[in-house]
């Protein structure tokens, strides 16, 4: 009789996570009598996956009924495959004995598990930055196999090129993770902008996964300040307006100072949004000219999003307002629109308007 051979026809099998894997094995002879066992790996540390003779293997089913007469098909089906099941599986014939003796092994079948990447999670900077600054966004996805994966970054639909990507681990593993960091230069128009991390993998059938982050979480658009005086009213009161424009986020506190003394403090709330996502706010202060002997220095002080205050001063010339008259008002704008803030690279920017 011919010598028994154990045939594992497939060198490799690839299965999607969650599916069943069929590992084929046939013997070429009924002789010698004895059971088949399946192992993952070789050597003393090999793992028993299925034994025809004994044991409980809830996820493994023999493809052919083991009690079938003259059975030489020892293929098995492993259910609910996970990346942890990846490895090389050996079908091993034993000769009946006390105990049974290992006789011959098949050549092995490598099981690779196709596992989908997790939904990409995009995280932005911990602190906000202003226009012209570069911020970093990180995208992470885990648990995929095989290792080959493609990651792209987009800002408002335009592909970005300034990013660095790593896939870990570098060596062989049951599953892999990807981490990519993109550098994005902010502009004042980015409140409504979005960055998208797109991951393509063989398991996704051409339908990539996307993770997004809104630049509104990363950007701060400092306000412009303008203080103006309306015409004198008949009751000797001057209406001074502080216009705070094009700022984001909404978190803003405005304080009026009269000759350096706090007159009123207001907090911005429920402001309508501009088309570009920024906000405007206007505050008025009525100054009773007749109550002052000297010129009044008004300061509109704005503290935006926890940053150092920005001041805009304005002098109301009392001498220009005869107490008995309600016309020919004159005022002089002596202030500067100082927009000071300290940013990441420690430079000071001074804007004068």
């Amino acid at each position: 009789e011919e010598e028994l051979q154990v045939i594992q026809p497939e060198k490799s099998v690839s299965v999607a996570a969650g599916e069943s894997a069929t590992l084929n094995c046939t013997a070429t002879s009924l002789i010698p009598v004895g059971p088949i066992q399946w192992f993952r790996g070789v050597g003393p540390g090999r793992e028993l996956i299925y034994s025809q003779k004994e044991g409980h293997f809830p996820r493994v089913t023999p493809v052919s009924d083991p009690t079938k007469r003259n059975n030489m098909d020892f293929s098995i089906r492993i259910s609910n495959i996970t990346p942890a099941d990846a490895g090389t599986y050996y079908c091993v014939k034993f000769r009946k004995g006390s105990p049974d003796v290992e006789l011959k092994s098949g050549a092995g079948t490598e099981l690779s598990v196709r596992a989908k990447p997790s939904a990409p999670v995009v995280s932005g900077p911990a602190v906000r930055a202003t226009a012209e600054h570069t911020v970093s966004f990180t995208c992470e996805s885990h648990g995929f196999s095989p290792r080959d994966i493609t990651l792209k970054w987009f800002k408002n639909g335009n592909e970005l090129s300034d990013f660095q990507t790593n896939v870990d681990p570098a060596g062989k593993s049951v599953s892999y993770s990807i981490r990519s960091t993109a550098r994005v230069v902010l502009t004042r128009r980015d409140v409504h902008s979005q960055v998208i991390c797109e991951v393509a993998h063989v398991t996704l059938q051409g339908d990539p996964l996307r993770g997004t982050a809104n630049l509104s979480e990363a950007i701060r658009v400092p306000p412009f300040l303008e203080v103006t005086q309306q015409s004198m009213r008949a009751d000797n009161q001057v209406n001074v307006t502080c216009q705070v424009t094009k700022f984001y986020p909404q978190r803003l506190q405005l304080t009026w100072l009269e000759n350096g003394n706090v007159s009123r403090t207001e907090m911005a709330s429920a402001l309508p949004e501009n088309k570009d996502g920024t906000y405007n706010w206007t505050s008025w202060l009525l100054v009773n000219v007749s109550a002052h002997r000297d010129d009044v220095k008004l300061t509109c002080q704005v503290e935006h999003d926890g940053q150092p205050a920005v001041n805009k001063s304005f002098s109301v010339k009392v001498s220009a307002h005869p107490k008995e008259q309600g016309s020919n008002t004159a005022a002089e704008n002596t202030g500067t629109n100082e927009r000071d803030y300290k940013d990441d690279d420690d430079k000071h920017h001074h804007h004068h308007h």
Epitope: V33, Q52, K53, E54, R69, K96
Partner: antibody, heavy 119, light 110 residues
Framework: QVQLVQSGAEVKKPGASVKVSCKAS????????INWVRQAPGQGLEWIAM????????HYNQIFKDRATLTTDTSTSTAYMELRSLRSDDTAVYYC????????????WGRGTLVTVSS | DIVLTQSPDSLAVSLGERATINCRAS??????????IFWYQQKPGQPPKLLIY???NLDSGVPDRFSGSGSGTDFTLTISSLQAEDVAVYYC????????FGQGTKLEIK
Amino acid sequence: QVQLVQSGAEVKKPGASVKVSCKASGYTFTNYWINWVRQAPGQGLEWIAMIDPSDSETHYNQIFKDRATLTTDTSTSTAYMELRSLRSDDTAVYYCAMDYGSLYAMDYWGRGTLVTVSS
Amino acid sequence: DIVLTQSPDSLAVSLGERATINCRASKSVSSSGYNYIFWYQQKPGQPPKLLIYLASNLDSGVPDRFSGSGSGTDFTLTISSLQAEDVAVYYCQHSRDLPTFGQGTKLEIK
């Protein structure tokens, strides 16, 4: 180590029934056929029937088809052979045997159960 | 049904001598290149023990003085050099279809 442990000896009256048990250990009970064979005193071996514990498929020797019933309890890995309408010539040692190679052979045997039918 | 006839019914052989037992089937027990004949040894008060499977293959733990041969309908069990512990009754069995046994051959020492 494969072991088949059979129930103890029985004495029965003609016309009665007997149920012999065979408890298997040391292997996966549902993966191998169980055969039943009997041997009358001083006589040869006579095959009665076989059962597949995984699905209770059975094959009977025509001589015993109407009187013998094979069953299994997979929860306890036990096979049973019931023989009805006993006659004196049913006096014999009844063996269970496991087929390890699915060749319809008998690789491992129990020690036997003596059933005596006498009025 | 296939009937198996063993010969002789009994046999006496000197220690160290060859013992030969024959088994003839009423029709071929061969299928797919295999001969479905099995040989058993039964000693007094013990269950039978499988010696040979598929006509010529020695079961685990069986001394190699035992051998089996034959094909189709005619089969032989040979003990090349009889030992005292070989005294027993020997049975052939087929499984070409449902199993049957031969009537047995009693082997004694001369």
